[in-house]
C-alpha cells in the first residue's frame, strides 16, 4: 500500500525532517506550512491548525517561502544619483542602480553606496578602458596617426584619414584635412564608439583591486580623476 500523505500540521517521524515548503514549529512540535513569497505568517500553527498566512502590506515584501511574523520593509527611495531598476513589490525589494553615465565607486552589501560620474576623455585622448558598473573610464593619449575631437566617456581614438594631398595634417585632437580628391582611411582598429556599460543590478562584490601607486601614476591606472595630461575632464 502506498504511504499515506500527511497533511499539515503533522508530527514528523523521529529523526525525520519536514517536506519542502514546510518548517518545524518548535512550540507545536509539528511540521507546518510555510507562507509563499508576498505573504507572511499571521498566525503560527498549533497541533491542530496550520499556519495562517496574510499578504504583505504596502512597501513590504517577502521574497522566499517563509514563516516570518512580519514582512521585510522595502528599502528607501533611490537617491537622486540612482535610478530604480526594480520596483518594490510584495515579492521583491526595490533595487537602485547608478544612473546611466555613472558607475558605482563604492559597493556595499546593500547595494551601491556611492555613485560617481564616468570620466570623460578630452580631445586628444580616447577611451583605453571603458567604464563598467563598478569602475571608471580610463583615458589614453591618441597615438600618432589617430585622433579624438570629442569630450566623451565612450569614444576611442580614430585613425586619421589618408590624403593623396594633405591640406592640414592631423594631430591628436583633429583629423587630417585633404585637398579635393577623396580620402581613404588608414588601416587601424575600426571601432569608433564604445557603448555605455549596460546598467543592470549593482554587483555586491568588490572589483579586483587595481595596483596602487604613488604620484606620477601612469595613464592606465584608474586612480582618481586624471589630470589634463591624461586627457579627462569634468562636465
Amino acid at each position: 500500500l502506498p504511504a499515506q500523505v500527511a497533511f499539515t500540521p503533522y508530527a514528523p517521524e523521529p529523526g525525520g525532517t519536514c517536506r519542502l515548503r514546510e518548517y518545524y514549529d518548535q512550540t507545536a512540535q509539528m511540521c507546518c506550512s510555510k507562507c509563499p513569497p508576498g505573504q507572511h505568517a499571521k498566525v503560527f500553527c498549533t497541533k491542530t491548525s496550520d499556519t495562517v498566512c496574510d499578504s504583505c502590506e504596502d512597501s513590504t515584501y517577502t521574497q522566499l517561502w517563509n514563516w516570518v511574523p512580519e514582512c521585510l520593509s522595502c528599502g528607501s527611495r533611490c537617491s537622486s544619483d540612482q535610478v530604480e531598476t526594480q520596483a518594490c513589490t510584495r515579492e521583491q525589494n526595490r533595487i537602485c542602480t547608478c544612473r546611466p553615465g555613472w558607475y558605482c565607486a563604492l559597493s556595499k552589501q546593500e547595494g551601491c553606496r556611492l555613485c560617481a560620474q564616468l570620466r570623460k576623455c578630452r580631445p586628444g585622448f580616447g577611451v583605453a578602458r571603458p567604464g563598467t558598473e563598478t569602475s571608471d573610464v580610463v583615458c589614453k593619449p591618441c597615438a600618432p596617426g589617430t585622433f579624438s575631437n570629442t569630450t566623451s566617456s565612450t569614444d576611442i581614438c580614430r585613425p586619421h584619414q589618408i590624403c593623396h594631398v594633405v591640406a592640414i595634417p592631423g594631430n591628436a585632437s583633429m583629423d587630417a584635412v585633404c585637398t579635393s580628391t577623396s580620402p581613404t582611411r588608414s588601416m587601424a582598429p575600426g571601432a569608433v564608439h564604445l557603448p555605455q556599460p549596460v546598467s543592470t543590478r549593482s554587483q555586491h562584490t568588490q572589483p579586483t583591486p587595481a595596483p596602487s601607486t604613488a604620484p606620477g601614476t601612469s595613464f592606465l591606472l584608474p586612480v582618481g580623476p586624471s589630470p589634463p595630461a591624461e586627457g579627462s575632464t569634468g562636465d
Partner: antibody, heavy 116, light 112 residues
Framework: QVQLVQSGAEVKKPGASVTVSCKAS????????IIWVRQAPGQGLEWMGW????????NSAQKLQDRVTMTTDTSTSTAYMELRSLRSDDTAVYYC?????????WGQGTLVTVSS | DIVMTQTPLSSPVTLGQPASISCRSS???????????LSWLQQRPGQPPRLLIY???SRFSGVPDRFSGSGAGTDFTLKISRVEAEDVGVYYC?????????FGRGTKLEIK
Amino acid sequence: QVQLVQSGAEVKKPGASVTVSCKASGYTFSTYGIIWVRQAPGQGLEWMGWISAFNGNANSAQKLQDRVTMTTDTSTSTAYMELRSLRSDDTAVYYCARGEDFFDYWGQGTLVTVSS
Amino acid sequence: DIVMTQTPLSSPVTLGQPASISCRSSQSLVHSDGNTYLSWLQQRPGQPPRLLIYKVSSRFSGVPDRFSGSGAGTDFTLKISRVEAEDVGVYYCTQSTQFPFTFGRGTKLEIK
C-alpha cells in the same frame, strides 16, 4: 590607535604643482576611503575629493577635476593628493581624513602657500 | 550638488547654557540603503576638524554626552546641553550621502 600624518608645509609659485601625502596607521588601510578637504585662511571647509584605498575609484569636486589627482599606495598605507597649475587662491590648509560614511580621523593639516 | 545651509552663522552663548545649531539640506539625505549620512564636526581654533556626531544622532567615541544630534530628511540640529569653555570653535554639518560631499558654511560658537 588610528593616526593620519601629513607631509610638511609647502611654498609654491603660481603655475607649479604640489603633492601632499597622508600616511595612515592603526587600521587596515584598504578598508576605508580617504577624503581630501581644504580650508583657505579664515574660510570654511571645502571638499576636494574622495578615493577608495581598496580599488582606486575616486571622485573629485567638479571645479578641481582638471587639476587634482588622488592616488593611494597600499604598500605604505599612504594617500597622495596632487594639485597642479597652482593659483594664489589655492593657498590653504589641506587635510586628509578617513572614511566615506563619516570622517572619523583627520590629519594634522598641511599648509600650502602659493605666492610669487 | 546638495547645498547645506547652517543657521546661525554666529552664536554667542553663556557658559552653562544650552546652544543649538540648525542645518538644512537642499534635498533629502536619506540614502537608498536607509541610512542618513549627516555628520557634525567641531573645529577648535588652530586645530583640524573633529567628528562629533555621525548618521544624524550617533555620538562618536570620546565625545561628551552634552552633544546630541537629531533630525531627519532635510532638517537637522546639533544641541549642546550645557556649553563649556572648551566648546568654543566652529561647527560644521556635512553630508556624505552622495557625491560631491558638501559642508555647511560653519557656525561660530563664542562665549558671551
